[in-house]
Interface confidence: medium
């Protein structure tokens, strides 16, 4: 999906008002310095591409993020403010339904959510030069 036509300001507002708090709740008890940020993004559409990938694509050691509150709200924000996004998800959803995973918070998931926090922070500061 091409995130170029999203309403970035509305997505930013949703992040600041609620998604950020859910990410903090998920990471509670973890030191902010515990994980290094290894995933980066260069502009807002790129950030949303990376955020979608890390939030919804199962990875080795962390298959359960899609069930989390921050993930549901991320999906809602993309559906509401990115035209045509919902349609790209219909087939993917039907495949996902066949492989439900148990909800387990692993160290790998915490690391992944730490990366998400970094991507979201970058999304909110699009004019900063890439490090």
């Amino acid at each position: 999906y091409d995130f170029t036509n999203c309403d970035f300001e509305k997505i930013k507002a949703a992040y600041l008002s609620t998604i950020s708090k859910d990410l903090i709740t998920y990471m509670s008890g973890t030191k902010s310095t515990e994980f290094n940020n290894t995933v980066s993004c260069s502009n807002r559409p790129h950030c949303l591409t990376e955020i979608q990938s890390l939030t919804f694509n199962p990875t080795a050691g962390c298959a359960s993020l899609a069930k989390e509150m921050f993930a549901m709200k991320t999906k809602a924000a993309l559906a509401i403010w990115c035209p045509g996004y919902s349609e790209t998800q219909i087939n993917a959803t039907q495949a996902m339904k066949k492989r439900r995973k148990r909800k387990v918070t692993t160290n790998k998931c915490l690391e992944q959510v730490s990366q998400l926090q970094g991507l979201w922070r970058r999304f909110n500061r699009p004019l900063l030069k890439q490090q």
Epitope: K10, K73, A79, P83
Partner: antibody, heavy 124, light 107 residues
Framework: QVQLVQSGAEVKKPGSSVKVSCKAS????????ISWVRQAPGQGLEWMGN????????NYAQKFQGRVTITADESTSTAYMELSSLRSEDTAVYYC?????????????????WGQGTLVTVSS | DIQMTQSPSSLSASVGDRVTITCRAS??????LTWYQQKPGKAPKLLIY???SLQSGVPSRFSGSGSGTDFTLTISSLQPEDFATYYC?????????FGQGTKVEIK
């Protein structure tokens, strides 16, 4: 199974306001949006606006901008549609509908569950 | 706002007929299209979402096709309970607009 139950019929004077409620049961209220759609006698369907309780965000059809306010009370799983400065052309059946689901498994933009409709008559 | 134009506005058909209703969007909406059936005095019923996905519980004689600007709802073999008004609706940017409706009447 989600159900939407709307408030009863209303008769209003021109220039006044009406507030119609839509109570949801049987699902997670914040995991979907609520749309409001109206239908004047013998006419087609007209979308008025959506509310997304998950963010407390509402968007409206241009035609109704400034005259309609859609709100949601998550504690009672109820959505409200208030239309002000009523005129005779606002006489219609007003429907609420579940619009899209944003749960773990993504749904779609269809309005798949509808309230029974509320007839609002505007007459002097 | 995106305009949706349905054709025909009404049609007469017999039980067993194949019926086709078309819907045209004023701009590209990908597959962000739904079809509804409405009977007099009742709320609309969702038939098709995402242009071609059949809503759960809807008979397989209903099908949808198209993408971009041109869409079609087909009833392969019209049944007595299918006489109703049909509406298309786009939701490309979550500001949905409906077509004006197609009334399917008994010939």
């Amino acid at each position: 199974q989600v159900q939407l139950v709307q408030s009863g019929a209303e008769v209003k004077k021109p220039g006044s306001s009406v507030k119609v409620s839509c109570k949801a049961s049987g699902g997670t209220f914040s995991s979907y949006a609520i749309s409001w759609v109206r239908q004047a006698p013998g006419q087609g369907l007209e979308w008025m606006g959506n509310i997304y309780p998950i963010f407390g965000y509402a968007n409206y059809a241009q035609k109704f901008q400034g005259r309609v306010t859609i709100t949601a009370d998550e504690s009672t799983s109820t959505a409200y549609m208030e239309l002000s400065s009523l005129r005779s052309e606002d006489t219609a059946v007003y429907y609420c509908a579940r619009y899209g689901q944003y749960g773990q498994h993504f749904s779609h933009g269809g309005m798949d569950v509808w309230g029974q409709g509320t007839l609002v008559t505007v007459s002097s | 706002d995106i305009q949706m134009t349905q054709s025909p506005s009404s049609l007469s058909a017999s039980v067993g007929d194949r019926v086709t209703i078309t819907c045209r969007a004023s701009q590209d909406i990908s597959i962000s299209l739904t079809w509804y059936q409405q009977k007099p005095g009742k709320a609309p019923k969702l038939l098709i979402y995402g242009a071609f996905s059949l809503q759960s519980g809807v008979p397989s004689r209903f099908s949808g096709s198209g993408s971009g600007t041109d869409f079609t709802l087909t009833i392969s073999s019209l049944q007595p309970e299918d006489f109703a008004t049909y509406y298309c609706q786009q939701f490309y940017f979550h500001s949905p607009t409906f077509g004006q409706g197609t009334k399917v009447e008994i010939k």
